[in-house]
Amino acid sequence: EDGGPACYGGFDLYFILDKSGSVLHHWNEIYYFVEQLAHKFISPQLRMSFIVFSTRGTTLMKLTEDREQIRQGLEELQKVLPGGDTYMHEGFERASEQIYYENRQGYRTASVIIALTDGELHEDLFFYSEREANRSRDLGAIVYCVGVKDFNETQLARIADSKDHVFPVNDGFQALQGIIHSILKKSCIEILAAEPSTICAGESFQVVVRGNGFRHARNVDRVLCSFKINDSVTLNEKPFSVEDTYLLCPAPILKEVGMKAALQVSMNDGLSFISSSVIITTTHCSDGS
């Protein structure tokens, strides 16, 4: 795409964008921020949705992994004409509805929400936004907030998962470009490799899952390694160790040669899963090997 760091994680990414009247003269900066960030998530298993809010929330692009649809969605995003109030809660509701209904092959995909706003939310609107963000979290989402210009950081820390999930942009909209790298680093949860990738049939093993962002979980005690065996049975295992760039997990005992286990990771005790193209296969090992 445009070079530089990228994210290979397979999850659902929601952009919830303020298009209220106060961003009227800054929509281009918001668009270019989203466009550049979107191009850095490159897993074929990553799905993306664009949601805009003002006096109501609208799904501009429903959840899709189709890169052509994402390109068209970005074109639609560029055409948005801001105006109206800052009903951020409406944006979260649109995201939650998709999280709730758009599961993949019978399991819920992990969801990351990046919500951007430029103003302070007054009284009821803050209460509503916090409540709807909590409901998104109840469905397994990780919530990040980007605050530009006249935002209230204390409010955004309560809407986001924590203060660490807030990206303040104090120097105005033109400074949005400067946080792309840090947002990418923080919001990316990816599985890159498993060591060993081949294990002996019928024997117990430990697997090192290499990746990034495993400590982004709200509670690292809720991180699970998940093995989808031969596209049917899924076994979840609690890791022995959770570090940001690797997990140490017990591998399930796979009795037969040629069995395949696709690796997934849950950050929330199995409520939802980050997918990958990493596969562990079994082979025949002779005694003493």
């Epitope: 429903k62 959840l63 899709t64 809660h89 998709q98 709730y100 209904y101």
Partner: antibody
Framework: QVQLVESGGGLVQPGGSLRLSCAAS????????MSWVRQAPGKGLEWVSL???????YYADSVKGRFTISRDNSKNTLYLQMNSLRAEDTAVYYC?????????WGQGTLVTVSS | DIELTQPPSVSVAPGQTARISCSGD??????VSWYQQKPGQAPVLVIY???NRPSGIPERFSGSNSGNTATLTISGTQAEDEADYYC???????????FGGGTKLTVL
Amino acid sequence: QVQLVESGGGLVQPGGSLRLSCAASGFTFNSYAMSWVRQAPGKGLEWVSLISSGSSTYYADSVKGRFTISRDNSKNTLYLQMNSLRAEDTAVYYCARAGFKFDNWGQGTLVTVSS
Amino acid sequence: DIELTQPPSVSVAPGQTARISCSGDSIPNYSVSWYQQKPGQAPVLVIYADSNRPSGIPERFSGSNSGNTATLTISGTQAEDEADYYCQSYDNTSPDLVFGGGTKLTVL
């Protein structure tokens, strides 16, 4: 403005089949989940089925395996194929734009299952 | 599955405040909507996400959700508010949309 118009209701014998349609206009149909809700004579509302914008489908236990919801985004139309109909399926069937709420409803179409 | 319980009927004098309750386990975790249905008509959404009013719905309609009960409040009830009212929510564990049994509001 948003408009939902149901059709296809009528009298059918127990064990028979019927296909309901709902023509939608006034909104971006393919971006919304859509649902069927029914109301038996003199009774309350009962959710029947939902199809998400990405075409994932969900059903109430009472109709699972008998009813099939589908959508044709090119025609802005929602469908409900009802098979193995029973007397207790007699109701007015409403098509509704859905999510966590049903924010727009059609006027309904009456399905009567009787011999 | 989540079950929503409503009183079958509520009566109120014109100009007074009517309160219709909807109870269910863990209801505050879920978004509650309310619908008004008049005889022979389709339901109309009057409150969504616990307390939000769609455009065109009079300000006398309000909603709240706390404890194990969601409440629809109609302040200064008018004769035209006489109708059946249904609460509705969803089940977090499996995609299932649920309605309460309905409450008949009579304006005396």
